[in-house]
């Protein structure tokens, strides 16, 4: 029993207030924001994160928008509302009593109502298409080490299991990860992969969620592999729902 | 070293009341939870309740509640239980540990015995 | 409560035996898990802890292993000095809970 032991800290998450007063002396960490006791042997869910984040000191910080191909994520921050579970509740609303629903990311999925707004359920995302453009290199990369880095990334990082890194696509300077998982083909204790995605841009824009780890160093052949735009695309099961204004606007 | 050092025996009435104390050493006294260990002569152990002083949060096995206080001195590391109206069934040994995840030191004991 | 069932109560084994204890819990506890030495007179000490991480100081012939419900205690080489009691202790949830002991007397 050593010292290092004695360390009770969230190793998965940073955003969070940690005490050894679980049952035994259990270190237990809950996230700020929420209070909620959070498993740290496992990634975070993202609405926990977001609340976590809306709750933190507020710096400076420029919101990327990103253009509108189908479901991106153009509303950045918002402080959400999260399920007993730490799922996004499917309806969410401002302080203005503006509502909307959103998907298993929390991503908006309709228009913006009021209150008598209903979601009548979390539409799950079950496909996440990551793209990526990396900064100029002397050489393309090759692309079944860029797959097997960013599969071995993936499972190893974010403990995805290997199955739902569907594909890893590129044609220089552009790569493109596609993240599956249906409802049926998520088993108790699986990642989530809309966690794994979150923290992975998180990750890609130099602000790791992992307490005292090192930022993500990505390298291929002991290439560095720099990225400098990252675009997500989210696709639900059930199709959203968003007037006819705002798909010709 | 981590060394919990219990006060002594005690003898008590019917129906007193004992406060006993679990002086903590070695350690930062704020960072760990202190448990009170209950045992009975050739029985074994039962779980009474826990402390961190770090924030004075308690918890209690639900047959001491009412009967334990479970208190922590910050000046002077020490941990405290007392016992409230007494009986024979309370006669035991009691112990208390600093846990960490499951792992313990115990102190010494300290034994308690309830006669008119 | 976590209720934890643990045997044998008691057992004779003879030097340089191997040794295994038991404990069922009534439900998954995710391998918080613990084990105690006590022997006559004296406070308990800490074996195992984490189902299976043994404490620094404690000789290698102790181990424990198990999940879920189900976890065990070996000594793989029973010394004269290994004779007490020894309890599991379950830490999942409050309250914590002892299983019953076992005492382990040379045969």
């Known amino acids: 029993h050593t010292a290092a032991q004695d360390n009770c800290t969230c190793p998965t998450n940073k955003m969070t207030v940690c005490s050894p007063d679980g049952p035994g002396g259990r270190c237990q960490c809950r996230a700020l924001g929420s209070g909620m006791a959070v498993d740290c042997s496992t990634l975070t869910s993202k609405c926990l994160l977001l609340k976590a984040r809306m709750s933190a000191p507020k710096n400076a910080r420029t919101l990327v928008r990103p253009s509108e191909h189908a479901l991106v994520d153009n509303d950045g921050l918002y402080d959400p509302d999260c399920d007993p579970e730490g799922r996004f509740k499917a309806r969410q609303c401002n302080q203005t009593s503006v509502c909307w629903c959103v998907n298993s990311v929390g991503v908006r999925r309709t228009d913006k109502g009021d209150l008598s707004l209903r979601c009548d359920e979390l539409v799950r995302t079950h496909h996440i298409l990551i793209d990526l453009r990396h900064r100029p290199t002397a050489g393309a990369f090759n692309h079944s080490d860029l797959d097997a880095e960013l599969r071995r990334l993936f499972r190893e990082r974010y403990r995805l299991h290997p199955k739902f890194v569907a594909a890893v696509h590129y044609e220089q300077p552009t790569i493109q990860i596609e993240l599956r998982q249906n409802t049926s083909q998520k088993a108790a204790g699986d990642v989530d992969i809309g966690d794994a995605a979150y923290y992975f841009e998180r990750d890609i824009k130099g602000e790791s969620l992992f307490q005292g780890r090192g930022g993500l160093d990505l390298r291929v052949r002991g290439e560095p592999l720099q990225v400098e735009r990252t675009l997500i695309y989210y696709l639900d099961e059930i199709p959203p729902k968003f007037s006819m204004k705002r798909l010709t606007a | 070293q981590v060394q919990l050092q219990q006060s002594g025996p005690e003898l008590v009435k019917p129906g007193a009341s004992v406060k006993m104390s679990c002086k903590a050493s070695g350690y930062t006294f704020t960072d760990y939870v202190i448990n009170w260990v209950k045992q009975r002569p050739g029985q074994g152990l039962e779980w009474v309740g826990q402390i961190y002083p770090g924030s004075d949060g308690t918890y209690y096995n639900e047959p001491f509640k009412g009967e334990a206080t479970l208190t922590a001195d910050k000046s002077s590391n020490t941990a405290y239980m007392q016992l409230s109206s007494l009986t024979s069934e309370d006669s035991a040994v009691y112990f208390c540990?600093?846990?960490?995840?499951?792992?313990?030191?115990w102190g010494q004991g300290t034994l308690v015995t309830v006669s008119a | 409560d976590i209720k934890m069932t643990q045997s044998p109560s008691s057992m004779f084994a003879s030097l340089g035996e191997r040794v295994t204890i038991t404990c069922k819990a009534s439900q998954d506890i995710n391998w918080y898990l613990s084990w105690f030495q006590q022997k006559p007179g004296k406070s308990p000490k800490t074996l195992i802890y984490r189902a299976n991480r043994l404490v620094d100081g404690v000789p290698s012939r102790f181990s424990g292993s198990g999940s879920g419900q189900d976890y065990s205690l070996t000594i793989s080489s029973l010394d004269y000095e290994d004779m007490g009691v020894y309890y599991c202790?379950?830490?999942?949830?409050?309250?914590?809970?002892f299983g019953a002991g076992t005492k382990l007397e040379l045969k």
């Open positions: 540990a600093r846990f960490f995840e499951g792992f313990a030191y």
């Open positions: 202790l379950q830490y999942e949830e409050f309250p914590l809970t």
